[in-house]
Interface confidence: medium
């Protein structure tokens, strides 16, 4: 019939996509010192790319404005970086000891929309 | 030598990645009524997935805290949606006329980090 032969636009799928794919893991750069809460250390690179939940929650849901996009599964991943620590005074100024270290940063593997039962005031 | 044989950790590449891939086009759901600033119309779906710049600017840059992730190239894309408009009162309640409409929404194709010359106070 006419209906079988025609190409269709699936609005339900578009609606689902807005809900499903707007809150997903995505790239963010994090400052290693801030992330590890270390003040007296310098890293190279200063920042690393991590996967963190972001975007917004598909606004097709009821009370969508009261929803937040949170991690549903977090894993710790190792990253190799150079760590510099202030050393002793030398003739040519402050020396730094350098080491290649493995640090662990949180990566979000799955994201969920967490919605409060009632919208914000 | 030992250094040649050992697989190198390319820290420069990690540094570049943090700058390059943290500010990129990513999925966001937008409320069509809000986006088009239309009050007396209802759409299905209410929301659509669009590509908008997001993330943060690679914090390896100087004054990275004063940088914002903005669209470097924006294109308008068509989306088919159903538009309902309140009709006249009928016996069985308020009638709605329905139309399939093509709306245009902004999609960000490229993102740039725009940094002010000095950091915020």
């Amino acid at each position: 019939s006419y209906h079988d032969r025609k190409s269709k636009v699936d609005l339900d799928r578009l609606n689902d996509d807005a809900k499903r794919y707007s809150c997903t893991p995505r790239n963010y750069s994090v400052n290693i010192r801030e992330e590890l809460k270390l003040a007296n250390v310098v890293f190279f690179p200063r920042c690393l790319l991590v996967q963190r939940c972001g975007g917004n929650c598909g606004c097709g849901t009821v009370n969508w404005r009261s929803c937040t996009c949170n991690s549903g599964k977090t894993v710790k991943k190792y990253h190799e970086v150079l760590q510099f620590e202030p050393g002793h005074i030398k003739r040519r100024g402050r020396a730094k000891t350098m080491a290649l270290v493995d640090i662990q940063l949180d990566h979000h593997e799955r994201c969920d929309c967490i919605c409060s039962s009632r919208p914000p005031r | 030598s030992y250094h040649d044989r050992k697989s190198k950790v390319d820290l420069d590449r990690l540094n570049d990645d943090a700058k390059r891939y943290s500010c990129t086009p990513r999925n966001y759901s937008v409320n069509i009524r809000e986006e088009l600033k239309l009050a007396n119309v209802v759409f299905f779906p209410r929301c659509l997935l669009v590509q908008r710049c997001g993330g943060n600017c690679g914090c390896g840059t100087v004054n990275w805290r004063s940088c914002t992730c903005n669209s470097g190239k924006t294109v308008k894309k068509y989306h088919e949606v159903l538009q309902f408009e309140p009709g006249h009162i009928k016996r069985r309640g308020r009638a709605k006329t329905m139309a399939l409409v093509d709306i245009q929404l902004d999609h960000h194709e490229r993102c740039d980090c725009i940094c002010s010359s000095r950091p915020p106070r």
Epitope: R5, S7 | E80, L100
Partner: antibody, heavy 126, light 107 residues
């Protein structure tokens, strides 16, 4: 604003050829099925041909089958009708019109012939 | 092929009259039918789709009803701008077919 603009009509001798074009704007042409409809002077409307969004399905009225060819160029937002072996009875105003089918909430809804072009006149006469 | 028989082929009516036009399909077409209005020298304009749904922007004095093989277009109170020719169209199966048209004239 949705617009369909036909062109290419004119006077042609029986047995001759013409190519009609329909330029589309203001909507996502590549997702719509497109149609040609004609109207002979003082007569009613007659469906001529349809083409699906990706050109995978094409249909013709028996009266034009084997003589007319419908095609589209989604990159150019254009619909075409190649008319060969024209006859006097092909004299008409030719309109292009769009149609689409959508599914939502388990319902299939057809939005067909909601926008038409202004028409282009084809006259087949010796 | 599905034949669409439209009646009457013409009618005369006055402003304010209630006008009814019918279309009969030679076989069941569910609600896959639309109604169009055409004025001289102009392209057709869709009034009703899916047998009974009013096209956005069309006055509510126009209404459609029916399913299967019998369909009706009603103009509840004829206005001066409604004098035109009206066509039904079935899109249940190819070839798509129009009714023969109904010319609504001023009495």
């Amino acid at each position: 604003e949705v617009q369909l603009v036909e062109s290419g009509g004119g006077l042609v001798k029986p047995g001759g050829s013409l190519r009609l074009s329909c330029a589309a704007s203001g909507f996502n042409f590549r997702t719509y099925n497109m149609n040609w409809v004609r109207q002979a002077p003082g007569k009613g409307l007659e469906w001529v041909s349809s083409i699906s969004s990706s050109s995978s399905n094409i249909y013709y009225a028996d009266s034009v089958k084997g003589r007319f060819t419908i095609s589209r160029d989604n990159a150019k937002n254009s619909l075409y009708l190649q008319m060969n072996s024209l006859r006097a009875e092909d004299t008409a105003v030719y309109y292009c019109a769009r149609d689409i089918m959508i599914t939502f909430g388990g319902i299939i809804a057809s939005f067909y012939f909601d926008y038409w072009g202004q028409g282009t006149l084809v006259t087949v006469s010796s | 092929d599905i034949q669409m028989t439209q009646s009457p082929s013409s009618l005369s009516a006055s402003v304010g009259d209630r006008v009814t036009i019918t279309c009969r399909a030679s076989q069941g077409i569910r609600n896959d039918l639309g109604w169009f209005q055409q004025k001289p020298g102009k392209a057709p304009k869709r009034l009703i789709y899916a047998a009974s749904s009013l096209q956005s922007g069309v006055p509510s004095r126009f209404s459609g009803s029916g399913s299967g093989t019998e369909f009706t277009l009603t103009i509840s109170s004829l206005q001066p701008e409604d004098f035109a020719t009206y066509y039904c169209l079935q899109h249940n199966s190819y070839p798509l077919t129009f009714g023969g048209g109904t010319k609504v004239e001023i009495k």
